[in-house]
């Protein structure tokens, strides 16, 4: 009797997910830290020549809070981008029904702290679109798995998530 | 520092339209993440929230009250307002307008408040 | 509608710890804020985030909220804390509990 192949005939478990938990980060590392999003670049301004790095996401999947009533939150770096969309798909097949939802983007207010990475567009907070907070801890996870590279369980009402700069070495290599 | 101002009728007959202003001084309205509220109490003691206004006119309302409340914001004059319609006896109180702040996702605080009008609704 | 509940007063012994809860489901996932509200007085913000102190604010109050219950401590209650106590919570509805009155004997 001939043994299946290496990894041939085995059933694949799905990848037990447990959730953050509350103040917890993940790596467990500083944000603008090499080994996380990296360093603050500066602040992007509407007039600023690094405006144009910014792109708006229109994915229907996101819901958008929006308090500001002017767009802001919609826009981030590609990569942020990319990461969202990815997070977008899973939280929907983690709860049918669901959708994930931003309440906080690019910020041009100035009400985050000093060198805040929601400043250049590459920080978004999050929670589900129906704001059961029962559900945060694992809505980290799914954010973790989707490629954020960082994810802070920071309050009771939202996930914090950022990602490296477009022109950082990690990110164009895809680490 | 920043003070907030109530002013308007002490007495309302009943069926009538009641209508508060704030005004806010030693700082901007338009000044993001804070939420111009409404807050009302009634003689037996209880704090009832009315409703609130960010700068960008986005309102939220108490349930129970949002068929009869509008809450209104002039950037120019650094004010807020309420309007309450069909007011009854049960609309007796002291008003008081008041500073929310943002703790999470409308999570509000309210950390500063005006010294409240009383306002009396009868024939 | 969400409601929070209060006892409606509490006695403490000057010097002593005056603790007073709010109740409310899951009200853990919620941030608590609690005021303090002297006859004829405006309330005033003691605790929030529920936690913290807002400038000013003496450090004998503190605050904390987990599972159903929040709780607003005074350690070492003063004659002067002497008061009604609101706590409130909610998410894009804010809601008071129905308020304590302390009473430092």
């Known amino acids: 009797i001939i043994g299946p192949g290496r990894g041939f005939g085995k059933r694949r478990h799905p990848k037990k997910l447990t959730p953050l938990a509350y103040k917890q980060f993940i790596p467990n590392v500083a944000e603008k830290t090499l080994g996380a999003s990296g360093r603050y670049e500066g602040k992007i301004t509407r007039n600023s020549e690094r405006f144009k790095e910014l792109t708006p996401n229109y994915n229907p999947d996101i819901i958008f809070k929006d308090e500001e009533n002017t767009g802001a939150d919609r826009l981030m770096t590609q990569r942020c981008k990319d990461k969202l969309n990815a997070l977008a798909i899973s939280v929907m097949n983690q709860w049918p029904g669901v959708k994930l939802r931003v309440t906080e983007g690019w910020d041009e207010d100035g009400h985050h702290s000093e060198e805040s990475l929601h400043y250049e567009g590459r920080a978004v907070d999050i929670t589900t679109s129906d704001r059961d907070r029962s559900k945060y801890g694992m809505l980290a996870r799914l954010a973790v798995e989707a490629g954020f590279d960082w994810v802070y369980y920071e309050s009771k009402a939202h996930i914090h998530c950022s990602v490296k700069a477009e022109n950082s070495v990690a990110a164009k290599s895809g680490g | 520092q920043v003070q907030l101002q109530e002013s308007g009728p002490g007495l309302v007959k009943p069926s009538q339209t009641l209508s508060l202003t704030c005004t806010v001084s030693?700082?901007?309205?338009?000044?993001?993440?804070?939420?111009w509220s409404w807050i009302r109490q009634h003689p037996g003691k209880n704090l009832e929230w009315i409703g609130s206004?960010?700068?960008?006119?986005?309102?939220y309302y108490n349930p129970s009250l949002k068929s009869r409340v509008t809450i209104s914001v002039d950037t120019s004059k650094n004010q807020f307002s309420l309007k309450l319609t069909s007011v009854t006896a049960a609309d007796t109180a002291v008003y008081y307008c008041?500073?929310?702040?943002?703790?999470?996702?409308?999570?509000?605080?309210?950390?500063?408040w005006g010294r409240g009008t009383l306002v009396t609704v009868s024939s | 509608s969400y409601e929070l509940t209060q006892p409606p007063s509490v006695s403490v012994s000057p010097g002593q710890t005056a603790s007073i809860t709010c109740s409310g489901e899951k009200l853990g996932y919620k941030y608590v804020c609690w005021y303090q509200q002297k006859p004829g007085q405006s309330p005033v913000l003691v605790i929030f985030?529920?936690?913290k102190r807002p400038s000013g604010i003496p450090e004998r109050f503190s605050g904390s909220n987990s599972g159903n219950t929040a709780t607003l401590t005074i350690s070492g209650a003063q004659a002067m804390d002497e008061a009604d106590y609101y706590c409130?919570?909610?998410?894009?509805?804010?809601?008071f509990g129905g308020g304590t009155k302390l009473t430092v004997l």
């Open positions: 206004i960010y700068y960008s006119g986005n309102t």
């Open positions: 030693g700082g901007s309205i338009n000044s993001g993440g804070f939420y």
């Open positions: 008041a500073r929310g702040n943002d703790s999470g996702d409308y999570d509000w605080y309210f950390d500063l």
């Open positions: 409130q919570a909610g998410d894009s509805s804010a809601v």
């Open positions: 985030h529920d936690n």
